[in-house]
């Protein structure tokens, strides 16, 4: 058994942290495979990640944390019964991939305006929650040329579109996704999409 | 009560060995790292071996490193200190104390909150 | 190791007055979690020594609040706002933050 691409390892800097890799050939990864890792602290324990499939030859594991600050770092090992497989280590500061935004909401009953809100996936008490910037990506399925990316660099978890902007008698879709500028983080995974008729008809006298 | 209990100290000749026991009670003792510290006649307090709860991890002062042996059977909430190559040096009063919370990813300290009565070894030919 | 370095060594109190114990290390004991991982410790005569304060700055339980830490990152400061005839014996403070753990050379608090 053999690893063919070592585990990469992706920090929600709250909980989580997300490590996938690939095997040499098909791999029953939660039966044949285990992730260990332990905290490089005092007195700190190992703890086991049992792995699932991705695809044929992939495997992913989620680590469980209590949470994530600067100076931690994990020694990780890939075993295969008795067989040590993989060392590694793994900074999660260093390797941050924010939680998606959720609740991604529009509301088309605020006067030639479509207001997107959306929430922020942090509690305020973790050190990502005032760092996080947006982009909000429209599209419509009516019309296969028109998708935008509306950069949102302020803090607030909101976006305002003139209606008139937007085709009339059509639908659109959004989502939405986040980074920490300050932690040099990855883009999120978009959010879920949320889907809007805009029936906004400028006034007759601008027709 | 949260209670610790050593036992096994006494009269040991350099070289020798002796086994010193802690009895744990009144918590959950498997989720606990615990920790020796000895304290020479007249002298300050010196630690001496910690283990993480699970027993996965020990740490050792230089001074005992390589004589010493820390250890812990959860099912009894018992914890150990083997004591092998004994030293003049080695006499004092040593104390097991409860450390930090170790069952967490990351451990959590309450610092070394319950101390036991002490236990004497005395090296002397 | 990291070095601890307490003073003064020696302590003459008045009851009712107040006292302040000083305990220096040779590196940072602050981890990022914010924690500063330095305890004191009393040890009265006769006894096993019981924790007054954890994480530079947590009383622990049972102790009376005259007792007080503070400090962050290698100076930290023991203070007893009124000493009572009962706070006698000795002082230890100690780096938990990574093994080997090391103590103080003590100071031995005095009723004058």
């Known amino acids: 058994m053999k690893v063919l691409q070592e585990p990469a390892c992706v920090s929600d800097y709250m909980s989580i942290s997300t490590c996938e890799w690939k095997m040499g050939g098909p791999t029953n990864c939660s039966a044949e495979l285990r992730l260990l890792y332990q905290l490089v602290f005092q007195s700190s324990e190992t703890h086991t990640c049992v792995p699932e499939n991705n695809g044929g030859v992939g495997c992913v594991c989620h680590l469980l944390m209590d949470d994530v600050v600067s100076m931690d770092n994990y020694t990780l090992d890939l075993w295969a019964g008795q067989q040590l497989l993989w060392k590694g280590s793994f900074k999660p500061s260093e390797h941050v991939k924010p939680r998606a935004p959720g609740n991604l909401t529009v509301h088309t009953n605020v006067s030639d305006t479509v207001l997107l809100t959306w929430s922020n996936p942090y509690p305020p008490d973790n050190y990502l929650y005032n760092d996080l910037t947006y982009a909000v990506n429209i599209w419509s399925e009516n019309d296969p040329a028109y998708s935008r990316i509306h950069n949102v660099t302020y803090l607030k978890p909101t976006l305002r579109i003139p209606a008139s902007t937007l085709k009339s008698g059509i639908s659109y879709r959004a989502r939405v996704r986040a980074w920490a500028q300050h932690y040099n983080t990855t883009w999120s995974e978009w959010s879920p999409s949320t889907k809007w008729y805009n029936s906004y008809r400028e006034p007759f006298e601008q027709r | 009560e949260v209670q610790l209990v050593e036992s096994g100290g006494g009269l040991e000749q350099p070289g020798g060995s002796l086994r010193l026991s802690c009895a744990g009670s009144g918590f959950t003792f498997r989720d606990f790292a615990m920790t020796w510290v000895r304290q020479a006649p007249g002298k300050g307090l010196e630690w001496v071996s910690s283990v993480s709860g699970d027993g996965g991890n020990t740490y050792y002062a230089d001074s005992v490193k390589g004589r010493f042996t820390i250890s812990r059977d959860n099912s009894k909430n018992t914890l150990y200190l083997q004591m092998n190559s004994l030293r003049a040096e080695d006499t004092a009063v040593y104390y097991c104390?409860?450390?930090?919370?170790?069952?967490?990813?990351?451990?959590?300290?309450?610092?070394?909150?319950?101390w036991g009565q002490g236990t004497t070894v005395t090296v002397s030919s | 190791d990291i070095v601890m370095t307490q003073s003064p060594l020696s302590l003459p109190v008045t009851p009712g007055e107040p006292a302040s114990i000083s305990c220096r290390s040779s590196?940072?004991?602050?981890?990022?979690?914010?924690?500063?991982?330095l305890d004191w410790y009393l040890q009265k005569s006769g006894q096993s020594p019981q924790l007054l304060i954890y994480?530079?700055?947590n009383r622990a339980s049972g102790v009376p609040d005259r007792f007080s830490g503070s400090g962050s990152g290698t100076d930290f400061t023991l203070k007893i706002s009124r000493v009572e005839a009962e706070d006698v014996g000795f002082y230890y403070c100690?780096?938990?933050?990574?093994?080997?753990?090391?103590f103080g050379q003590g100071t031995k608090l005095e009723i004058k």
């Open positions: 590196q940072s004991l602050l981890y990022s979690n914010g924690y500063n991982y």
């Open positions: 994480l530079s700055s």
């Open positions: 104390a409860k450390d930090r919370l170790s069952v967490t990813v990351r451990p959590r300290y309450y610092g070394l909150d319950v």
């Open positions: 100690m780096q938990a933050f990574q093994a080997p753990y090391t």
